[in-house]
């Protein structure tokens, strides 16, 4: 049977907690990538962001997660309306932004 | 020491709102990851689930009774307060308050309860 | 909801017993299980949260294991203290739900 909404969302976070718990050298090799606009569709932003980082094991995984997620085929080079203009981040921080709103979204009972 | 101590009217007829304070102890509800739940337990049976509030004002109720209950806090005075509207002999029970704390997975363990505070239903 | 199912409601041992209560959830609830205590005219007090991490002050003769849908509480030798009704609760996600409670008695 299909895993509940709810589910995914919780071991979508638990792989975020992972890797900024278990972090010792920079992740991804310090690389950068599109910050985005959280307040909307976030998984295929996040997504779109995160798939132009390659060779990068960590978050591998979270990239899987993400694609499950979003209901369209996300390839490298995309972008959509959701990235900030013009603004890159570490993929450290880009993780530990992506948490918080995640977080916030499963507090609030908010799985779609 | 984390305390929670919880305070109603004892007794309340069919119909009203009831009205029950969780007054904390110890720590703070303004402090980032905290929450704060509601249960309750009928004389000899088992125990409900409430309602939930985060520090950051984010609520969660049991849908069974979510058109009844309104949970809400004042940082100010370190409370939580529920409401339960329309009660009910049913809705006898004792009232429990309870501390979740959610550092890194969400959890929802509560750590740390109040005594309770026994409500009567009956006119 | 996820609905807990615990057994035994009830059961009689003696003290230097090793006890096992069972909770089965309606769905997998990835190891966010829970386990209280709850003596007669008391709150009840966390024992064990996620599956298995003991909450602080609980002695060690009280663990948890478990995966998935099914979960375990063991008191590896019961003492007159453990006189309570024990509770499973689900911690994935509101509503968060109890088991109907297991009554342990000593012979």
């Known amino acids: 049977s299909p895993v509940p909404r709810s589910t995914a969302l919780k071991e979508l976070i638990e792989e975020l907690v992972n890797i900024t718990q278990n972090q010792k050298a920079p992740l991804c090799n310090g690389s950068m990538v599109w910050s985005i606009n959280l307040t909307a569709g976030v998984y295929c932003a996040a997504l779109e962001s995160l798939i132009n980082v390659s060779g990068c094991s960590a978050i591998e995984k979270t990239q899987r997660m993400l694609n499950g997620f979003c209901p369209h085929k996300v390839s490298a080079g995309q972008f959509s309306s959701l990235r900030v203009r013009d603004t890159k981040i570490e993929v450290a921080q880009f993780v530990k932004d992506l948490l918080v709103h995640l977080k916030k979204l499963f507090r609030e009972g908010r799985f779609n | 020491e984390v305390t929670l101590r919880e305070s109603g009217p004892g007794l309340v007829k069919p119909t009203q709102t009831l009205t029950l304070t969780c007054t904390l102890y110890g720590f703070s509800l303004s402090t980032s990851d905290m929450g704060v739940d509601w249960i309750r337990q009928p004389p000899g049976k088992g125990l409900e689930w409430l309602a939930h509030?985060?520090?950051?004002?984010?609520?969660r109720y049991n849908p069974a009774l979510k058109s009844r209950l309104t949970i809400s806090k004042d940082t100010s005075k370190n409370q939580v307060v529920l409401k339960l509207t329309s009660v009910d002999p049913v809705d006898t029970a004792t009232y429990y308050c309870?501390?979740?704390?959610?550092?890194?997975?969400?959890?929802?363990?509560?750590?740390?309860w109040g005594q309770g505070t026994l409500v009567t239903v009956s006119s | 909801d996820i609905q807990m199912t615990q057994s035994p409601s009830s059961l009689s041992a003696s003290v230097g017993d090793r006890v096992t209560i069972s909770c089965r959830a309606s769905?997998?609830?990835?190891?966010?299980l829970n386990w209280y205590q709850q003596k007669p005219g008391k709150a009840p007090k966390l024992l064990i949260f996620?599956?298995?991490k003991l909450h602080s002050g609980v002695p060690s003769r009280f663990s948890g294991s478990g995966s998935g849908t099914d979960y375990t509480l063991t008191i590896s030798s019961l003492q007159p203290e453990d006189i309570a009704t024990y509770y499973c609760q689900q911690g994935l996600t509101p509503p968060l739900t109890f088991g109907g409670g297991t009554k342990v008695e000593i012979k």
């Open positions: 309870a501390r979740t704390v959610s550092s890194g997975y969400i959890y929802y363990a509560m750590d740390y």
């Open positions: 996620y599956t298995s």
């Open positions: 769905q997998d609830i990835r190891n966010y």
């Open positions: 509030i985060w520090w950051d004002d984010v609520k």
